[in-house]
Amino acid sequence: EQAPGTAPCSRGSSWSADLDKCMDCASCRARPHSDFCLGCAAAPPAPFRLLWP
């Protein structure tokens, strides 16, 4: 069980004090007001692949 500040969340995730847990930044599209989404905005997004040539 990770405590805030003891280890960083993995790339593409951010710490939620509300849930006491690292959360996937991808969920911020559906729930933009989640507390961890501020941390996602400050971090680069996870890599994605273009769906067109």
Partner: antibody, heavy 123, light 111 residues
Framework: QVSLKESGPGILQPSQTLSLTCSFS??????????VSWIRQPSGKGLEWLAH???????RYNPSLKSRLTISKDTSRNQVFLKITSVDTADTATYYC???????????????WGQGTSVTVSS | DIVLTQSPASLAVSLGQRATISCRAS??????????MHWYQQKPGQPPKLLIK???NLESGVPARFSGSGSGTDFILNIHPVEEEDAATYYC?????????FGGGTKLEIK
């Protein structure tokens, strides 16, 4: 619609292990962000959060009781379990399970609760 | 642990008047952009019911006569105008850190 229902032994003796079951419907504990908590309330007193289990099987416990608590789940059967070892008369209370789930504002506090199951520890 | 102290422990309010319940935290339950305070209503023989989440957001189906405010360590639940069905015990709860804790409750009686 969301519903939760607790079940337990009703009465047990000091030093025994209390086993509680929360059976729920209307949501899935495999949904990202979903979780279930156990909370208790001695008669005429306030609420005490005990433990929480997440969709990914991550668990959290109240430090004051952590050594005595074990929370687990059966996602396919829509059930969450709580075990409390070495019970004493101070563990006499109504035990509730409640859901925390994803919401536009973030992650709901405990928005749906069961009706509670009464547990008496007596010799 | 963050201790939540509610006041008063009980109050009696006349029908149609305002009820104000305070919840004070032993340390801040807010960040610069978020306040992790919630309010519940509990009637005898029933489980708690979520009224307000994250300080001021009314849960779906909760009447607009309920409102919440505050930040940091001081939070308020207001009910105005009070109705007969509001007779209950009200609890604050935080989710700023573990363990999640509840206030001791405020019992509201309608005169």
């Amino acid at each position: 619609q969301v519903s939760l229902k607790e079940s337990g032994p009703g009465i047990l003796q000091p030093s025994q292990t209390l086993s509680l079951t929360c059976s729920f419907s209307g949501f899935s504990l495999s949904t990202s962000g979903m979780g279930v908590s156990w909370i208790r309330q001695p008669s005429g007193k306030g609420l005490e959060w005990l433990a929480h289990i997440y969709w990914d099987d991550d668990k959290r416990y109240n430090p004051s009781l952590k050594s005595r608590l074990t929370i687990s789940k059966d996602t396919s059967r829509n059930q969450v379990f709580l075990k409390i070892t070495s019970v004493d008369t101070a563990d006499t209370a109504t035990y509730y399970c409640a859901r925390r789930g994803p919401d536009y504002y973030g992650y709901y506090p405990m928005d749906y609760w069961g009706q509670g199951t009464s547990v008496t520890v007596s010799s | 642990d963050i201790v939540l102290t509610q006041s008063p422990a009980s109050l009696a309010v006349s029908l149609g008047q305002r009820a104000t319940i305070s919840c004070r935290a032993s340390k801040s339950v807010s960040t610069s952009s978020y306040s992790y305070m919630h309010w519940y209503q509990q009637k005898p023989g029933q489980p708690p019911k979520l009224l307000i989440k994250y300080t001021s957001n009314l849960e779906s189906g909760v009447p607009a006569r309920f409102s919440g405010s505050g930040s940091g360590t001081d939070f308020i639940l207001n009910i105005h105008p009070v109705e007969e069905e509001d007779a209950a015990t009200y609890y604050c709860q935080h989710s700023r850190e573990l363990p999640w804790t509840f206030g001791g409750g405020t019992k509201l009686e309608i005169k």
